[in-house]
Each structure stands twice: as structure tokens, then as C-alpha cells.
């Protein structure tokens, strides 16, 4: 014969366990209520009565079914470096993220504990490897035939101009100079393509890879008055 | 956590070839992130960088003038080390000679965050 | 070569006390600046990277700043395991350089 539906509290069967949304109390040594999402155990259940449950106070919340004596605190505010995706409520934490140009460098539980900048890459070299919500930029030199002249944390390495004339050959940090005729890329005819004025900070030598199991000799030649600033040349 | 440990002898005689290794943990010498460093210092003149090995889909290779033309930084993937070979040495070039890990070549945010012990090398007859 | 010139090359202060480092280099590195600690027997320790930001572990007593040409490394409220050499670095241009050092001993 089916037993009766027990309402709260009641003794479970020897061996048995308490229903969902119910915890056994070692006390009262019965089965009792657990409190809902946003609200947690202001009086403990006994033989004859069940839990009292009540509202979250401000800046606390409780995210599961429990019987917690008090809610849990929220996280302290965002830092300038965080935006906020998940407000402080009764029932949910705040999560911090990092804002756009940051990455997370320490995470926690939920959302990030550190928010680092995400690193840019100097003129010569682009990134070979985006940033993620938990990664830093990689950068990579320009390979010969490319140019990067920004300092971004975005940018990879663009392929030069290729010129019918060339006033000034590329290098790993400036695009080509193009002369007479006009250039591949759409340009006006007969113009002169000067490219953007970029400061000789961080420009290197045409990076040549040196063989995978043993990099050949690569020198650092000064060019001008300056040496080149990440040379990276090989065999 | 990143270590360094740095093998090499302490004494090389003036013309010989100076060659030290740094082996790896806790980092790849063929990490797409990280490049591998050669500096030494001496009383007569102070921290001195000498060179780096580094791979971004191919090997780089980076080494200071002062030294162009006796320096090799070979990477070894089998045994996830580095090597330094100076040729020709002199008495100039005694110094403690360290390897460090670089991270962020090319970009901003660049430095030497972990150092091996060092190792005092002496160029003597 | 950028040349970094730091000075004092060194200077003596007591536990409590504040103290300023600078370094100049011979051409305008932007914001490309490294300060490092060294103490006796063993290898530089980084601090402070790009000039002005403290690296992850090392207390906030520590700070930088500058731009240029022109920086500044600062120690607040020294504490006895402060006392060490201390090195500037650039990275805008290889080769990658340092200052000659700064010797901060106790008086």
C-alpha cells in the first residue's frame, strides 16, 4: 500500500534519504525544508516545525536551494578596469569581466580577480596570436615582404605595396614608396605614395628564419644613426 | 612555475670556445610566447645582452654587435634547453653569464621574468 | 646603442625612509623601461615593467614612472630586504641595454 506524501518535517526511512529540496537536519534528526534561491534559514527546523526562511539583506545573495544561517556577501565593486555583467542581486553574485583591451590574467570562481592590459605589438612586428579573456597578445616579426607599423594590440603584419617603380623599398616597419607609375594597390596615376610618418622606434632588419634545429648566426647591423630596434635576421 | 638551470664550465682558456646550456621546466623553448636569453655580467661592464633565440611558427635569432661574429644561441627542442657558444674568447670576456625567459618580444610589456643561477666563467691560461 | 645612465650609482638610507632612483636614456624610448633588483650572489629580479607598472607579487612600495628619455624608480617606507642594486633596462631598440646600476646600502 503506497505510504501517505510526508510534509515537512518528518522522519526518513532507516537507510533512506530526504526528497529534493530537502536536507536531513542532524539536530532535529528529521527532514526539512530547504530555502529557495535568494533567501536562506532564519530558524531551523525542529521535530514539529519547519525551516523559517527569509529574504536576502542588501548586497547578499544565495544562488542554490540551502539552509545557510546567512546569505552569502556579494563581490566588492568592479575595479576601473572590470565592467560589470551580472549585477549583485539576491540571488546571483556580481561577475566582473575584464572591458575590451584587457584580458584576465587572474581568474576566479566566476568572472576575473586581475585584468591585465593586453599587450600591443610595436612597429616591425604583428600579431601572430590574438588576445583571448584569458590570453596575451603574441607578437611575431614581419616577415620579408611584410610591414607592420602601428603600435596594436589587433594588427598583423600587411604585405608592402607592390611598385612599377620603386622609390623606397619596404622594410618590417614601412611600406613601400612607390614611384613614376602607379602601384598594384589603387593608387592615382603618376602619384608618389608616401606612407603614414611612422618614428624609427622598433624598427628591425627583415627577420629571416633561422633553420628549426639550429638558428644560423644573425647579426644586428646599425642602419643610420640608430640600430635596428628588433633585429631578427638569420642564414 | 618557470626554472632555469644553467650547466656549463667555469674556466675556458683564452682562444677556446666558451658553451653553456640552460635547461628548461614549467616552459617550452619552442613556446610561441616566450624567447630565450643570453646575458652576462661583469664589473667593467655591468648587465650586457648577448643574444636570444626565439620561435614564432620559424626560428629567430638576435644578437648583439659587440659579439656578431663569435656567437651562436641554438635552441635544442629534444631536450627542451638552450645553448651559448662564444668563440675566441679573452680575458674580457669573464663575467657570470645568465640565461632568462623574455616575454613579449616585439611587443610592449617586454622583459626577463625568470633567471637562471648564473655561472661565473673565468678566461685564463 | 641607447646608452642608460642611472644615478646615483649609489646612495645610503635608513629602514623608514624614501628613496629615488633615476634613469635617463640617450634617446627618447617611450614608456619601453624595465627596473630590476639584484642582490649579492644572485640574478636580477623584475619590479616594474613599462615604466610605471608593478609586477604581479612585489609590494607597492615599489613604484615608476616616466617617458621619454626621463624615469624615475621610487622605494616608499624601506624595508631591511630592500637594500640591493638596482638596474634600469630598455627594450625600445636592440640591443636590449642597462644601466650601469644603483647600490642602495644602509647608513
Known amino acids: 500500500e503506497p505510504r501517505a506524501v510526508a510534509f515537512t518535517p518528518y522522519a526518513p526511512e532507516p537507510g533512506g534519504t530526504c526528497r529534493l529540496r530537502e536536507y536531513y537536519d542532524q539536530t532535529a534528526q528529521m527532514c526539512c525544508s530547504k530555502c529557495p534561491p535568494g533567501q536562506h534559514a532564519k530558524v531551523f527546523c525542529t521535530k514539529t516545525s519547519d525551516t523559517v526562511c527569509d529574504s536576502c539583506e542588501d548586497s547578499t545573495y544565495t544562488q542554490l536551494w540551502n539552509w545557510v544561517p546567512e546569505c552569502l556577501s556579494c563581490g566588492s565593486r568592479c575595479s576601473s578596469d572590470q565592467v560589470e555583467t551580472q549585477a549583485c542581486t539576491r540571488e546571483q553574485n556580481r561577475i566582473c569581466t575584464c572591458r575590451p583591451g584587457w584580458y584576465c590574467a587572474l581568474s576566479k570562481q566566476e568572472g576575473c580577480r586581475l585584468c591585465a592590459q593586453l599587450r600591443k605589438c610595436r612597429p616591425g612586428f604583428g600579431v601572430a596570436r590574438p588576445g583571448t579573456e584569458t590570453s596575451d597578445v603574441v607578437c611575431k616579426p614581419c616577415a620579408p615582404g611584410t610591414f607592420s607599423n602601428t603600435t596594436s594590440s589587433t594588427d598583423i603584419c600587411r604585405p608592402h605595396q607592390i611598385c612599377h617603380v620603386v622609390a623606397i623599398p619596404g622594410n618590417a616597419s614601412m611600406d613601400a614608396v612607390c614611384t613614376s607609375t602607379s602601384p598594384t594597390r589603387s593608387m592615382a596615376p603618376g602619384a608618389v605614395h608616401l606612407p603614414q610618418p611612422v618614428s624609427t622606434r622598433s624598427q628591425h632588419t627583415q627577420p629571416t628564419p633561422a633553420p628549426s634545429t639550429a638558428p644560423g648566426t644573425s647579426f644586428l647591423l646599425p642602419v643610420g644613426p640608430s640600430p635596428p630596434a628588433e633585429g631578427s635576421t638569420g642564414d | 612555475q618557470v626554472q632555469l638551470q644553467q650547466s656549463g664550465p667555469g674556466l675556458v682558456k683564452p682562444s677556446q670556445t666558451l658553451s653553456l646550456t640552460c635547461a628548461i621546466s614549467?616552459?617550452?623553448?619552442?613556446?610561441?610566447?616566450?624567447?630565450w636569453n643570453w646575458i652576462r655580467q661583469s664589473p667593467s661592464r655591468g648587465l650586457e645582452w648577448l643574444g636570444r633565440?626565439?620561435?614564432?611558427?620559424?626560428?629567430?635569432?638576435d644578437y648583439t654587435v659587440s659579439v656578431k661574429s663569435r656567437i651562436t644561441i641554438n635552441p635544442d627542442t629534444s631536450k627542451n634547453q638552450f645553448s651559448l657558444q662564444l668563440n675566441s674568447v679573452t680575458p674580457e670576456d669573464t663575467a657570470v653569464y645568465y640565461c632568462?625567459?623574455?616575454?613579449?618580444?616585439?611587443?610592449?610589456?617586454?622583459?626577463?621574468?625568470?633567471w637562471g643561477q648564473g655561472t661565473l666563467v673565468t678566461v685564463s691560461s | 646603442d641607447i646608452q642608460m645612465t642611472q644615478s646615483p650609482s649609489s646612495l645610503s638610507a635608513s629602514v623608514g625612509d624614501r628613496v629615488t632612483i633615476t634613469c635617463q636614456a640617450s634617446?627618447?624610448?617611450?614608456?619601453?623601461l624595465n627596473w630590476y633588483q639584484q642582490k649579492p650572489g644572485k640574478a636580477p629580479k623584475l619590479l616594474i615593467y613599462d615604466a610605471s607598472n608593478l609586477e604581479t607579487g612585489v609590494p607597492s612600495r615599489f613604484s615608476g614612472s616616466g617617458s621619454g628619455t626621463d624615469f624615475t624608480f621610487t622605494i616608499n617606507s624601506l624595508q631591511p630586504e630592500d637594500f640591493a642594486t638596482y638596474f634600469c633596462q630598455q627594450y625600445d631598440n636592440l640591443p636590449i641595454t642597462f644601466g650601469q646600476g644603483t647600490r642602495l646600502e644602509i647608513k
Open positions: 632568462a625567459r623574455e616575454d613579449g618580444v616585439g611587443g610592449t610589456k617586454d622583459y626577463f621574468d625568470y
Open positions: 633565440t626565439y620561435y614564432r611558427s620559424k626560428w629567430y635569432n
Open positions: 634617446q627618447d624610448i617611450s614608456n619601453y
Open positions: 614549467g616552459d617550452s623553448v619552442s613556446s610561441d610566447s616566450s624567447a
